[in-house]
């Protein structure tokens, strides 16, 4: 019997995702992997693919936390300067950024059914103890990039070594033994991101290797090129790697939502979260799990599927208008996506020129509001938040690289959907 569309959902790491929902997966030993995008497809499959960062054409690219790829500051015009990810050196072997490998002798308390899984990320080596599944066959095999050996055909996650190496999870089947999450769930705004899958993008092969892992404790340590061991922070019995954030768990109070701690090498730095003094609504509400009060999404003049209060706020975050213009001439399509900001009062326009599905030209311009008002053909398509715009621009950087070398039909249209703010199911953000 065919599953009704409305009932289709995806299960991934004990979490339900709606069809079309996008997120970055949480994978041990890395944590939240911003360089992998997952999407829940219409048939209930989880499709994940690795982000390919474009060469950044500026002198000093900026690494923005929670974004995978480096960005040019203030849409700097191009300079011919290629940026490449740092490789790692460990035990005399050089590993490329994103490469997974196995290490020996790192953990003294390693159990016989555990192995040490390491990965290279931006010049740092991240290693973790991985509990391997019980083997029920005589001749286990090694799988790419996993330190655990598995029985042929085992595992609920099947690998398709096709053109794009997409990794999938079967529809509506819970990955019951997926990685145990010892860290707090990041807020949805940080988890929802990325874009739809691209057959041409290489996936993080083996990133979801061990689908039958028991929920053993994962210890994460970082080793940089100077072989400094143990660059981690330990808080309340949990281990956090450099750059990771969490809300502290204090015995007397439980999880303190209004304090955010970050692991800085081995030192935890905690900051109080400051809530706004004034809210764009009369009666902001306190919601469990959130530090600050939130405005209940009052329905103002709405764009389809969106809820804003009367000052253009969505879930307490300011929204800005997004315009689009599509122009076709001589077999060439020029698509312009524009974001209007108040501070400064200007419009950022992203221009795509595509011929026969191949990206010919992509650039970003900033113009004054006065100039933008002169321009015809721009239609208001939605309002979005700065955080969604950041996700959009990151995705745009990826597909601008990808679509310049192969045919892209709907990638940009799919990406624009990231800007649409959906009304949250349970009435809160």
């Amino acid at each position: 019997e065919q599953v009704k569309h409305s009932e289709t959902y995806c299960m991934f790491q004990d979490k339900k995702y709606r069809v079309g929902e996008r997120w970055h997966p949480y994978l041990e030993p890395y944590g939240l992997v911003y360089c992998v995008n997952c999407i829940c497809s219409e048939n209930g499959n989880v499709l994940c693919s690795r982000v390919r960062c474009p060469n950044v054409h500026c002198l000093s690219p900026v690494h923005i936390p929670h974004l995978c790829c480096p960005r040019c500051p203030d849409s700097l015009p191009p300079v011919n300067n290629k940026v490449t990810s740092k490789s790692c050196e460990y035990n005399g072997t050089t590993y490329q950024h994103g490469e997974l490998f196995v290490a020996e002798g790192l953990f003294q308390n390693r159990q016989p059914n555990q192995c040490t899984q390491c990965s290279c990320s931006e010049g740092n080596v991240y290693c973790g103890l991985k509990t391997c599944p019980k083997l029920t066959c005589a001749f286990p095999v090694s799988v790419p990039d996993s330190c655990c050996r598995v029985c042929r055909g085992d595992g609920e996650l099947s690998w398709e070594h096709s053109d794009g190496d997409i990794f999938r999870q079967p529809a509506n089947r819970e990955a019951r033994h997926s990685y145990h999450r010892s860290h707090y769930d990041p807020p949805p705004s940080r988890q929802a991101g990325g874009l739809s899958r691209f057959p041409g993008a290489r996936s993080h092969r083996g990133a979801l290797m061990d689908s039958q892992q028991a929920s053993g404790t994962i210890v994460q340590i970082v080793i940089n090129n100077k072989h400094k061991h143990g660059q981690v922070c330990v808080s309340n019995g949990k281990t956090y790697s450099h750059g990771e954030s969490w809300h502290p768990n204090l015995r007397a109070f439980g999880i303190v939502e209004c304090v955010l701690c970050t692991c800085n090498v081995t030192k935890q730095e905690c900051k109080k979260i400051h809530c706004p003094n004034r809210y764009p609504c009369k009666y902001p509400q306190k919601i469990d799990g959130k530090c600050c009060k939130v405005c209940p999404g009052k329905k103002a003049k709405e764009l389809p599927g969106q809820s804003f209060d009367n000052k253009g706020y969505f879930c307490g975050e300011e929204t800005m208008p997004v315009y689009e213009s599509v122009f076709m001439e001589d077999g060439e399509t020029t698509r312009k996506i524009a974001l209007e900001t108040e501070r400064p009062p200007q419009v950022e326009v992203h221009v795509w020129t595509i011929r026969k599905g191949i990206l010919q030209h992509f650039h970003i311009e900033k113009i004054s509001k006065r100039m933008f008002e002169e321009l015809p053909h721009f239609k208001l398509v939605t309002r979005t938040t700065l955080s969604q715009w950041k996700i959009f621009t990151e995705g745009e950087a990826q597909i601008s690289q990808m679509c310049s070398s192969r045919v892209c039909r709907t990638e940009l249209e799919d990406l624009v959907k990231v800007l649409y703010l959906e009304r949250s199911e349970k009435g809160h953000c």
Epitope: L76, P77, E329, A338, P344, I367, M371
Partner: antibody
Framework: QVQLQQPGTELVKPGASVKLSCKAS????????MHWVKQRPGQGLERIGN????????NYNEKFKNKATLTVDKSSSTAYMQLSSLTSEDSAVYYC??????????????WGQGTTLTVSS | DIQMTQSPASLAASVGETVTITCRAS??????LAWYQQKQGKSPQLLIY???TLEDGVPSRFSGSGSGTQYSMQINTMQPEDTATYFC?????????FGAGTKLELK
């Protein structure tokens, strides 16, 4: 190839009006902004205004709002600029210029040869 | 309107020399800047747009750079045919405004 053709000279009396033309060829006339630029002898360049040939909507620099009127004739792919109440201050070279389509900022990639307007009695 | 201050007003350079012309905007123009070349008795020609993008057919000895309110154009080996007046133009706000021009002559 893209061409913007303008008459070389116009001689008119003070107080009169003149209609300068700019005939476009080699591209889709209605797809690109057309701008008009003034250059007085030995001086800099000033944009007078621009027109969207598709809709006929024109925008003017404040300074030229009561001086210039921009129009188009789509059938002949021609842009026009009418200058009224002419004085010696209006004696200048007037250029029509097209702006690039894949940029929103106005970058003038093709220019006419210019019409030298002389206002003299 | 945004004011564009161009300098120098004129200069003379020998063949092979490097020439730099600068332009200052009265406010941030976020890279929306173009450079035009106008030879005696001719109409202007677009050389560089969006701060540093060379228009098709423009020799690679021409280059542009800058950000915020400060921009410049460089000719890295002056040629006799580069004798002309050069104008910068901001395209960030309306109306687009030009600099007063720099007259470049051959020494």
């Amino acid at each position: 190839q893209v061409q913007l053709q303008q008459p070389g000279t116009e001689l008119v009396k003070p107080g009169a009006s003149v209609k300068l033309s700019c005939k476009a060829s080699g591209y889709t006339f209605t797809s690109y902004w057309m701008h008009w630029v003034k250059q007085r002898p030995g001086q800099g360049l000033e944009r007078i205004g621009n027109i969207n040939p598709s809709s006929g909507v024109a925008n003017y620099n404040e300074k030229f709002k009561n001086k210039a009127t921009l129009t188009v004739d789509k059938s002949s792919s021609t842009a026009y600029m009418q200058l009224s109440s002419l004085t010696s201050e209006d004696s200048a070279v007037y250029y029509c210029a097209r702006s690039k389509s894949n940029y929103v900022a106005y970058y003038f990639d093709y220019w006419g040869q210019g019409t030298t307007l002389t206002v003299s009695s | 309107d945004i004011q564009m201050t161009q300098s120098p007003a004129s200069l003379a350079a020998s063949v092979g020399e490097t020439v730099t012309i600068t332009c200052r905007a009265s406010e941030n123009i976020y890279y929306s800047l173009a450079w035009y070349q106008q030879k005696q008795g001719k109409s202007p020609q677009l050389l560089i747009y969006h701060t540093n993008t060379l228009e098709d057919g423009v020799p690679s000895r021409f280059s542009g750079s800058g950000s915020g309110t400060q921009y410049s154009m460089q000719i890295n080996t002056m040629q006799p045919e580069d004798t002309a007046t050069y104008f910068c133009k901001q395209a960030y706000d309306v109306p687009p405004t030009f600099g007063a021009g720099t007259k470049l002559e051959l020494k």
